[in-house]
């Protein structure tokens, strides 16, 4: 059994999240994850899910009764989702910490928008680039 | 030229983001994107970047002078990043809208944590599942 299981059960008790009524009105994440099988689609969704959990854990970081559980789960997330790659985790963390109301951040974001957009399509940076661009042109030719 | 380019230039004027001083103290997104070549890694980062832009655009949705530009760019993001797939965009939107301070959301998130974690490793849901599980077990086998 993976180490996070025991610690997640501990968090369930703390948050009173073990009861069947918690599942009322559908799921938050599981139903969405079920919709996506392609690895890159899954990463788009999991990126948001992982950032949600990190934010949640941050809000409870000073609560001693669940600190060990939270630290174990965060470590396990880093091993599983970021493959223990601290640079990946650090870059992710930077992105999640940018404030959308900061004027300098806004200006920078708009300044970079054209280049960000140019890289958004899959394979925009790989050898597949020419083909994907042609496909896009094809899609737009008949609009 | 893709439609977003002209509209992004319009936003640059609005946000006063065309000056060279905007690039001082490094980039927000471009430097990070440069670090990641693997498609799945890029999706992890781009997921956060796209959600940032959607939040930013939401804050300016009532500003008539840039409404057309914002709409055009959002549409282009949907084409490029979500491959015009409305279900993908809708699922993404749901994830970005969950409030981390909502008690019911917290309980649901903790309730689903074990299953979310089980799916975090690449290929956990694909044909490679058995092999990746064996690798993880192998790593922990001597405890």
């Amino acid at each position: 059994q993976d180490p996070y299981v025991k610690e997640a059960e501990n968090l369930k008790k703390y948050f009173n999240a073990g009861h069947s009524d918690v599942a009322d009105n559908g799921t938050l994440f599981l139903g969405i994850l079920k919709n996506w099988k392609e690895e890159s689609d899954r990463k788009i969704m999991q990126s948001q899910i992982v950032s949600f959990y990190f934010k949640l854990f941050k809000n409870f970081k000073d609560d001693q009764s669940i600190q060990k559980s939270v630290e174990t789960i965060k470590e396990d997330m880093n091993v599983k989702f970021f493959n223990s790659n601290k640079k990946k985790r650090d870059d992710f963390e930077k992105l999640t910490n940018y404030s959308v109301t900061d004027l300098n951040v806004q200006r920078k974001a708009i300044h970079e928008l054209i280049q960000v957009m140019a890289e958004l399509s899959p394979a925009a940076k790989t050898g597949k680039r020419k083909r994907s661009q042609m496909l896009f042109r094809g899609r737009r030719a008949s609009q | 030229q893709d439609p977003y380019v002209k509209e992004a230039e319009n936003l640059k004027k609005y946000f006063n983001a065309g000056h060279s001083d905007v690039a001082d103290n490094g980039t927000l997104f471009l430097g990070i994107l440069k670090n990641w070549k693997e498609e799945s890694d890029r999706k992890i980062m781009q997921s956060q970047i796209v959600s940032f832009y959607f939040k930013l655009f939401k804050n300016f949705k009532d500003d008539q002078s840039i409404q057309k530009s914002v709409e055009t760019i959002k549409e282009d993001m949907n084409v490029k990043f979500f491959n015009s797939n409305k279900k993908k965009r809708d699922d993404f939107e749901k994830l970005t809208n969950y409030s981390v301070t909502d008690l019911n959301v917290q309980r649901k998130a903790i309730h689903e944590l074990i299953q979310v974690m089980a799916e975090l490793s690449p290929a956990a849901k694909t044909g490679k599942r058995k092999r990746s599980q064996m690798l993880f077990r192998g790593r922990r086998a001597s405890q």
Epitope: Y4, E75, D76, N85, K86 | D41, R139, S142
Partner: antibody, heavy 124, light 111 residues
């Protein structure tokens, strides 16, 4: 002050087994990954194995997998490297090194703190 | 393989500047942090640059690290060379399974 102290090295015969230990102090031990790195006489550094902090996941060098086993006892701030079917080429100074705290995004550098090493000599 | 290739040795006079390269054979240099270690004869390796460009406290600013994505390599630069800089220098990064990998080491001789 962060300290890592290895012990258990010595002279063993080819084919024998040996367990080297590392005791740590000066930090919250269970939060940190621990690496084993070795250095043969006059040679470069070679990574041997890593064990994660609270989750105790184990990672091994491909060339050593199957012969070496890493484990840890967080209650006693200790890490162990069990080596079996030892060969002459395993003769080296074995270092215990503190890794990242992967539960903390502001963790100190990887492989920042090293022990002084324990010498393992495999010879008939 | 994921070899990190370093020159076997470099030598230079006191006061001069040297650069030691560390070229990644497979995988992308920018996707994994690079560390540099100094090991004096009979001593324990000591980190002099971590996370590509960062210097631990106590390491002089004569020592710096950088990444060059165009050559898929990292570099360690030491300016104002001093006799105490004479040592072996190792670069270190990670493979795609995030296992630790070391370069073969570079012997720096201060003439």
């Amino acid at each position: 002050e962060v300290q890592l102290v290895e012990s258990g090295g010595g002279l063993v015969k080819p084919g024998d087994s040996l367990t080297v230990s590392c005791v740590a102090s000066g930090f919250t031990f269970s939060n940190y990954f621990i690496h084993w790195v070795r250095q043969a006489p006059g040679k470069g550094l070679e990574w041997v194995a890593t064990i994660s902090g609270r989750t105790k996941y184990m990672f091994y060098s491909d060339s050593l997998r199957g012969r070496f086993t890493v484990s840890r006892d967080n209650a006693n701030n200790s890490v162990y490297l069990h080596m079996s079917s030892l060969r002459g080429e395993d003769t080296a100074l074995y270092y215990c090194v503190r890794g990242y705290d992967h539960s903390d995004s502001n963790s100190a550098a990887d492989l920042l703190h090293w022990g002084r090493g324990t010498l393992v000599t495999v010879s008939s | 393989n994921f070899m990190l290739t370093q020159p076997h040795s470099v030598s230079e006079s006191p006061g001069k500047t040297i650069t030691i390269s560390c070229t990644r054979g497979r995988g992308y240099i920018a996707s994994y942090y690079v560390q540099w270690y100094q090991q004096r004869p009979g001593g324990v390796p000591k980190i002099v640059v971590f996370e590509d460009t960062q210097r631990p406290s106590g390491v002089p600013d004569r020592i710096s690290g950088s990444i060059d994505t165009s050559t898929n390599s990292a570099s360690l630069t030491i300016s104002g060379l001093q006799t105490e800089d004479e040592a072996d220098y190792y670069c270190q990064s990670y493979d795609d399974a995030n296992h630790v990998i070391f370069g073969g080491g570079t012997k720096l001789t201060v003439l």
